[in-house]
């Protein structure tokens, strides 16, 4: 989650380092993630917590019991997309219905939020210069959001924030392979609130994933998974109202 | 190497059902989807859904969401479509493949839907 | 869905030649689009995909090209043995669709 870049690096090779889509306002630079005490502790929700972390409660997010990845995702087919009008995402000159879901429903069905837990299907895998982009709203009091980019049974790229981890708001970013999460990359700088809309956009590089919230750059994630083709499936849950998960090419 | 293997040809009889294997082999079965297209003959190709098989998601074309069921038995890496009420329309030859652009496919399954 | 049309069901070449087949999407499919070659009696073969990506082991002289809704695939010099049936394929979203083929002949 270094964030060691500049703008020339944010798109390398493509003569275009504020490429359609993506924020032109970077903002300020978090810091590096840095080791942060404690950080060792694998998984932002292997359904369990460090000691006292959640005293009496299990940890938001642990789904416990849960059959499958996402379970009470929508039935199959059910994709609408974003907003149209004014402020829709992304903005004009991609595809008016980014990525992947018409902006209704299948088959004139209108749109309207997602359900979730909610899976984006990518059926090519992703691949570098695609840019995932996701609006919503954060729930009044809210406890978490996850985002995981999945490689079957892996999660390739777990984005995690969490809005009170010890009276703290944190961002966790790992990787879980054969069911291990590995290492935790935090980050501090928290730009979502509890009950205001956001836009999550998440551009995948040759190296990293790089994320940008309310078109403010977050941070990047080097690839754990490195065959980025079989990230194949995007997992959105959490404490939020869902508008749209959409991808494009930039 | 990458193999997606399916049976040659099934007959089966209108108005029953029949079950289609593809055993995958060679790499990881539950880090790809597997996708189901159907080619009558001198026709095109058609999409009729697909499954990922780490956690059984499923996803239908409309057209064939009550005519095909898809399933995968991860303990052999094999996935399976289930056809139901058949009828001629639906003899054709039926693929499986691999992921979203299809590196990999099978032989194919010529099915016969005949009395 | 997604429609994806080529316009031409039969083109007509030489050896050596340069082709090209095009393939035009109803909607933005943002370049995931994939070409397939199939001869009788065989499965379907993918040439490319991500628009331009060669699939490995597939010859140089097939390229592929394309944003938004119009795609191309060209094949620099036809060999006899890329006399066959090509296909377009958007995997952009589900339903993916296909094109309804384009049938490469000799002259």
């Known amino acids: 989650m270094a964030d060691n870049f500049s703008l020339h690096d944010a798109l390398s090779g493509s003569g275009n380092p504020n490429p359609q889509g993506w924020p032109g306002a970077w903002g300020n630079q978090p810091a590096g993630a840095g080791g942060y005490p404690g950080a060792s502790y694998p998984g932002a929700y292997p359904g369990q917590a460090p000691p006292g972390a959640y005293p009496g409660q299990a940890p938001p997010g642990a789904y416990p019991g849960a059959p499958g990845a996402y379970p009470g995702a929508p039935a199959p087919g059910v994709y609408p997309g974003p907003p149209s009008g004014p402020g829709a995402y992304p903005s004009s000159g991609q595809p008016s219905a980014t990525g992947a879901y018409p902006a209704t429903g299948p088959y004139g069905a209108p749109a309207g939020p997602l359900i979730v837990p909610y899976n984006l299907p990518l059926p090519g895998g992703v691949v570098p210069r695609m840019l995932i982009t996701i609006l919503g709203t954060v729930k009044p009091n809210a406890n978490r959001i996850a985002l995981d980019f999945q490689r079957g049974n892996d999660v390739a790229f777990h984005f995690n924030p969490r809005f009170n981890e010890n009276n703290r708001r944190v961002i966790v970013c790992n990787t879980k392979l054969d069911n291990n999460w590995g290492r935790e990359e935090r980050q501090s700088v928290f730009p979502f609130e509890s009950g205001k809309p956001f836009k999550i956009q998440v551009l995948v590089e040759p190296d990293h994933f790089k994320v940008a919230v309310n078109d403010a750059h977050l941070l990047q994630y080097n690839h754990r998974v490195k065959k980025l083709n079989e990230i194949s499936k995007l997992g959105i849950s959490g404490d939020i109202d869902l508008t749209s998960a959409s991808y494009t090419m930039i | 190497q990458v193999q997606l293997q399916q049976p040659g040809a099934e007959l089966v009889g209108p108005g029953s059902s029949v079950k289609l294997s593809c055993k995958a082999s060679g790499y990881t079965f539950t880090n790809y989807w597997i996708h189901w297209v159907k080619q009558r003959p001198l026709q095109g190709l058609e999409w009729i859904g697909n499954i990922d098989p780490s956690d059984s998601e499923t996803h239908y074309n409309q057209k064939f969401k009550d005519k095909a069921t898809l399933t995968v038995d991860k303990s052999s890496s094999t996935a399976y479509m289930q056809l139901s009420s058949l009828t001629s329309e639906d003899s054709a030859v039926y693929y499986c493949a691999r992921h979203g652009y299809y590196d990999y496919w099978g032989q194919g399954t010529t099915l016969t839907v005949s009395s | 869905d997604i429609v994806m049309t080529q316009s031409h069901k039969f083109m007509s070449t030489s050896v050596g030649d340069r082709v090209s087949i095009t393939c035009k999407a109803s909607q933005d499919v943002s370049t995931a689009v994939a070409w397939y070659q199939q001869k009788p009696g065989q499965s379907p073969k993918l040439l490319i995909y991500?628009?331009?990506t060669r699939h490995t082991g597939v010859p140089d002289r097939f390229t592929g090209s394309g944003s938004g809704t119009d795609y191309t695939l060209t094949i620099s010099s036809v060999q006899a043995e890329d006399l066959a049936l090509y296909y377009c394929q958007q995997h952009y979203t589900t339903p993916l669709t296909f094109g309804a083929g384009t049938k490469l002949e000799l002259k």
């Open positions: 991500w628009a331009s």
